[in-house]
Interface confidence: medium
């Protein structure tokens, strides 16, 4: 297992609809064709996997159907979007990138993006 640098923004504020987007950028040492991206959440010293996707370079990320995550890739950048967040979901969201193929296997873990989620005060007669 070889180490790889992963960069992500320090702080992101989710939208009033509970959607947070951030870029996860990795310094690919070689020409990877298969990449796995995992989003982890750290809160109260507990780390939980939020979602994960494996993609072939040049193709779309495919998260599980109905996942709270979506994403697109461009070169060594992955644009991640997490939706349906509430204030209780505020925490440090860590991007983990694995270069799966071809060998050698590389692993990189970002320092995390602190996502702040504020529950909007429901406005009278607002839409979803």
């Amino acid at each position: 297992c070889k180490a790889m640098h992963v960069a992500q923004p320090a702080v992101v504020l989710a939208s009033s609809r509970g959607i947070a987007s951030f870029v996860c950028e990795y310094a690919s040492p070689g020409k990877a064709t298969e990449v796995r991206v995992t989003v982890l959440r750290q809160a109260d010293s507990q780390v939980t996997e939020v979602c994960a996707a494996t993609y072939m370079m040049g193709n779309e990320l495919t998260f599980l159907d109905d996942s709270i995550c979506t994403g697109t890739s461009s070169g060594n950048q992955v644009n991640l979007t997490i939706q349906g967040l509430r204030a209780m979901d505020t925490g440090l969201y860590i991007c983990k990138v694995e270069l799966m193929y071809p060998p050698p296997y590389y692993l990189g873990i970002g320092n995390g993006t602190q996502i702040y989620v504020i529950d909007p005060e429901p406005c009278p007669d607002s839409d979803f």
Epitope: R17, G18, I19, R41, A43, Q46, T48, V50, C51, L64, D65, D66, S67, I68, T70, Q83, G84, R86, A87, M88, D89, G91, D119, E121, P122, C123, P124, D125, S126, D127, F128
Partner: antibody, heavy 123, light 109 residues
Framework: QVQLVQSGAEVKKPGASVKVSCKAS????????MHWVRQAPGQGLEWMGI????????SYAQKFQGRVTMTRDTSTSTVYMELSSLRSEDTAVYYC????????????????WDQGTLVTVSS | EIVLTQSPGTLSLSPGERATLSCRAS???????LAWYQQKPGQAPRLLIY???SRATGIPDRFSGSGSGTDFTLTISRLEPEDFAVYYC??????????FGQGTKLEIK
């Protein structure tokens, strides 16, 4: 199809704790918030709290703060509700209920409920 | 904390009649965050209406919801025998505030 299956009825003594489970199937477990709602005999519905199975975060009704703990096990698609320091007033049917989600937007209503677990607190 | 008050407590009507159930909030509620449920004895509640007026999947069109601000109404245009049950309204205020009304019992006259 979506199914929520809860654990069986419990009889507890005052001061004890109870842990009720709710196993989900038929959908992506981590994509929908889960709630616990209780109903005392002949009474109305009372919201207890919410858990996000994806990240394990929780939020509880003020009334139950410090007495309730909600957890989940993603490997078995199960959520748990533990209520401690039980008293006779906690005798109720406890429901787990899934929150509606449309196009990724969470909508704060409950579309699927289990039939509930009766917890009786009696000395 | 927003309190929801339902009226009447009990409504006695005959099949074929029109039922009008009221839910009043102690302060203004977003209509997007108001729902109605039906509960029959020994069963879990069933979502009927959400967003004050949108019917949930599989709910017959005899059920309709309306209202805004502090006053909301559930209307059943022509009562069927299976409609006799307890009805609850529910609102959302934030992550820690999901509240229900005390319920209206709809019984056969």
């Amino acid at each position: 199809q979506v199914q929520l299956v809860q654990s069986g009825a419990e009889v507890k003594k005052p001061g004890a704790s109870v842990k009720v489970s709710c196993k989900a199937s038929g959908y992506t477990f981590t994509s929908y918030y889960m709630h616990w709602v209780r109903q005392a005999p002949g009474q109305g519905l009372e919201w207890m709290g919410i858990i996000n199975p994806s990240v394990g975060s929780t939020s509880y009704a003020q009334k139950f703060q410090g007495r309730v703990t909600m957890t989940r096990d993603t490997s078995t698609s199960t959520v748990y509700m533990e209520l401690s320091s039980l008293r006779s007033e906690d005798t109720a049917v406890y429901y787990c209920a899934r929150e509606v989600r449309v196009r990724g937007v969470i909508i704060p209503f409950f579309d699927y409920w289990d039939q509930g677990t009766l917890v009786t607190v009696s000395s | 904390e927003i309190v929801l008050t339902q009226s009447p407590g009990t409504l006695s009507l005959s099949p074929g009649e029109r039922a009008t159930l009221s839910c009043r909030a102690s302060q203004s509620v977003s209509s997007s965050y108001l729902a109605w449920y039906q509960q029959k004895p020994g069963q879990a509640p069933r979502l009927l209406i959400y967003g004050a007026s949108s019917r949930a999947t599989g709910i017959p069109d005899r059920f309709s919801g309306s209202g805004s601000g502090t006053d909301f109404t559930l209307t059943i245009s022509r009562l069927e025998p299976e409609d006799f049950a307890v009805y609850y309204c529910q609102q959302y205020g934030s992550s820690t505030m999901y509240t229900f009304g005390q319920g209206t019992k709809l019984e056969i006259k």
